[in-house]
């Protein structure tokens, strides 16, 4: 009620910026065609824009990417016994983040 | 119970050829790889290579290629690491140790007791 | 071929006392990293597969941490039949490879 004290803080923004997400490795970015193997490690640590900015007609984006190469095992099972082999994953990391304005939708035509 | 059973120890003359058998029991041969690890006096761990007992398939590492040659009978569940040419650096205890499954993980979860191989002229 | 360099070579504890030990890898082997207990005279014994997982059967006291190049084995408090040689292997890069061992010996 009025007056009442309170000792809950203010709510602080999550300011746009980059933070670490985590990123599942599908087995589908390895190989479309065979569902027989495992991928080791089956998610890995990518960093990413992400927060809210002041305005509503805004947007966090990254401005700037980079495309981070990594090894991952596959592990294809033949005959209940591991075949390994090794495969490249490429992981999207964002290096910086903006606050930009959304586009306006286009028509459907 | 998963076990694994070495033959007994042997001494050799340098030159000459020896051969490790390893039976297992308690899980089906034919579903996991074999590996051999050589063990020298006061050493670590070292290894040697593996062998799929279902079709005989074998994977080498490159300093033993011309050492040891592996081979398996499913009828036994029996596994054989032959050493040739043998040399006194040869002289070591020898393991058979099976290629366990732990979910994404193959570690060695079985070893039999090993075998001492020494060449002694 | 991916080189495991475990350290201390020996380690001179009491019983009760909390172990750790080290091994270090030349190259990244993500997690797959395990550990093997071995007494003299007898076979490797699993302890820890996957950096982190307890072997069933191995009682809790031992524990296994890391990833990438630094992996630790830690036992929380030595009982007398602790003490023996650990062995650290990886099974990310071909040859699979071993470290040299740490042995862990009464004080």
């Known amino acids: 009620s009025l007056g009442s004290l309170t000792i809950a803080e203010p709510a602080m923004i999550a300011e746009c910026k980059t933070r670490t997400e985590v990123f599942e490795i599908s087995r589908r970015l390895i190989d479309r065609t065979n569902a027989n193997f495992l991928v080791w490690p089956p998610c890995v640590e990518v960093q990413r824009c992400s927060g809210c900015c002041n305005n509503r007609n805004v947007q966090c984006r990254p401005t700037q990417v980079q495309l981070r190469p990594v090894q991952v095992r596959k592990i294809e099972i033949v005959r209940k016994k591991p075949i390994f082999k090794k495969a490249t994953v490429t992981l999207e990391d964002h290096l910086a983040c903006k606050c930009e304005t959304v586009a306006a939708a286009r028509p459907v035509t | 119970e998963v076990q694994l059973v070495q033959s007994g120890a042997e001494v050799k003359k340098p030159g000459s050829s020896v051969k490790v058998s390893c039976k297992a029991s308690?899980?089906?041969?034919?579903?996991?790889?074999m590996y051999w690890v050589k063990q020298a006096p006061g050493q670590g761990l070292e290894l040697i290579g593996r062998?799929?007992?279902?079709?005989?398939?074998?994977d080498y590492v490159e300093k033993f290629k011309n050492k040891a040659t592996l081979t398996a009978d499913k009828s036994t569940s029996t596994a054989y690491m032959e050493l040739s040419s043998l040399r006194s650096e040869d002289t070591a205890v020898y393991f058979c140790?099976?290629?366990?499954?732990?979910?994404?993980?193959?570690?060695?979860?079985?070893w039999g007791q090993g075998t001492t191989v020494t060449v002694s002229s | 071929e991916t080189v495991l360099t475990q350290s201390p070579a020996t380690l001179s504890l009491s019983p009760g006392e909390r172990a750790t030990l080290s091994c270090r890898a030349s190259e990244s082997v993500s997690t797959l990293m395990h550990w093997y207990q071995q007494k003299p005279g007898q076979q490797p014994r699993l302890l820890i597969y996957?950096?982190?997982n307890l072997e069933s059967g191995v009682p809790a006291r031992f524990s296994g941490s890391g990833s990438g190049t630094d992996f630790t084995l830690t036992i929380s408090s030595l009982e007398p039949e602790d003490f023996a040689v650990y062995f650290c292997q990886q099974s990310w890069n071909d040859p699979w490879t071993f470290g040299g061992g740490t042995k862990v010996e009464i004080k």
């Open positions: 140790a099976r290629f366990g499954a732990r979910s994404y993980f193959y570690p060695m979860d079985a």
């Open positions: 062998i799929d007992p279902e079709d005989g398939s074998t």
């Open positions: 308690g899980y089906t041969f034919t579903e996991s790889y």
């Open positions: 996957g950096a982190s």
